[in-house]
Amino acid sequence: HTAAQDNCTCPTNKMTVCSPDGPGGRCQCRALGSGVAVDCSTLTSKCLLLKARMSAPKNARTLVRPNEHALVDNDGLYDPDCDPEGRFKARQCNQTSVCWCVNSVGVRRTDKGDLSLRCDELVRTHHILIDLRHRPTAGAFNHSDLDAELRRLFRERYRLHPKFVAAVHYEQPTIQIELRQNTSQKAAGDVDIGDAAYYFERDVKGESLFQGRGGLDLRVRGEPLQVERTLIYYLDEIPPKFSMKRLT
């Protein structure tokens, strides 16, 4: 891998340390926090990005109604354990030996327990619903133009195969982007919908992980599309296991 030509940086991940110590003096970049070598021609996994973030210094509608198994990331940031491929380990524990099971996007899907808690497998998040609210505009965006712009964004910026963008719904001012990717659909080299959603979330928050041009420039027929709220729902291939007390 050669990173940016002028100064050995990682165009797809700011949270790296890069140096020209790869084979043949090529630029090699390692994620902060884990020291794992990353491929700067594609997205870095969410697990490695969260780990890097924790190591950094502190500072009758067309809209879909998420079903009762949809998860929202209410727990916020934590320092995750990643496997050698950069995926979340199924069981995560904190420094006080409190443990829980997570899905493939690192969101808790069980009650918290102790070190005896078993998480047999990493359950795949196969459906992600990104719920956006855009800032007021003179009028509603044309739905087909909005759909085309968001599909183009995920294809170009996140390199997500178009088949994984299942739908774009719009009911002013709410936009919903549905990403779907079953285990059987994901081929080697395909960007994971969880990673694409995380990069998108950081982009719309003005915290872009990309080097270079910086933030998003979303426009629908020249009109800026500015997002003022984001909520992401995660649906797993196997429903989560929470006790009833959490649901009341």
Epitope: A4, D6, T9, R152, E156, G212, D217, R219, R221
Partner: antibody, heavy 126, light 103 residues
Framework: AVTLDESGGGLQTPGGALSLVCKAS????????MFWVRQAPGKGLEWVGV????????NYAPAVKGRATISRDNGQSTMRLQLNNLRAEDTGTYYC???????????????????WGHGTEVIVSS | ALALTQPSSVSANPGETVKITCSGS???YGWFQQKSPGSAPVTVI????KRPSDIPSRFSGSTSGSTGTLTITGVQADDEAVYFC????????FGAGTTLTVL
Amino acid sequence: AVTLDESGGGLQTPGGALSLVCKASGFDFIDYDMFWVRQAPGKGLEWVGVINRSGSYTNYAPAVKGRATISRDNGQSTMRLQLNNLRAEDTGTYYCARGACTHCWDADSAGYIDAWGHGTEVIVSS
Amino acid sequence: ALALTQPSSVSANPGETVKITCSGSSGSYGWFQQKSPGSAPVTVIYWNDKRPSDIPSRFSGSTSGSTGTLTITGVQADDEAVYFCGNADSSGTFGAGTTLTVL
């Protein structure tokens, strides 16, 4: 069909300024990044600069940085290159080109150019 | 910026397959055909493997690591030209050009 037409070339004096215009047609200009690329006589292609689709971002080659300004008028489907303090080494054919990947993290790359203009010749000489 | 490296010349008989390589960047490669000095370049491949609709299917592109490859399958006399590769991670760069001679 995608058409890019450059104009404004000709004989220029050293130290002077030139203004080249690229007029686009056959596609939604507002949806594409645009490039300027030049070629000195008998030499290879040289990336001059890029402007994103909204005009909010520009980037320039070191050889022209500080002397070049790229702007665009999406209503008129035109892009302009203003180059000041002309030097003999600015001589060449200047091409307008279209970038196919406006959201890409490396969208400044020449690797995304999918269409070219016919070029306009610039000669800087006293 | 690092230069993109491509061979200065290649030659082939009509009907043969020609491969032109370009190395030096992990970004997206484009390939541009120029039939004579001063004539406008024509994009034959952009974004690694995408071919404009008016370009014959005998032109294809691929990448592996930091190397891009332009393949012309069943080369024709009309393909004789200089081929420039283009790429960059942060600012645009072109290779010096490869002259394709069809024998």
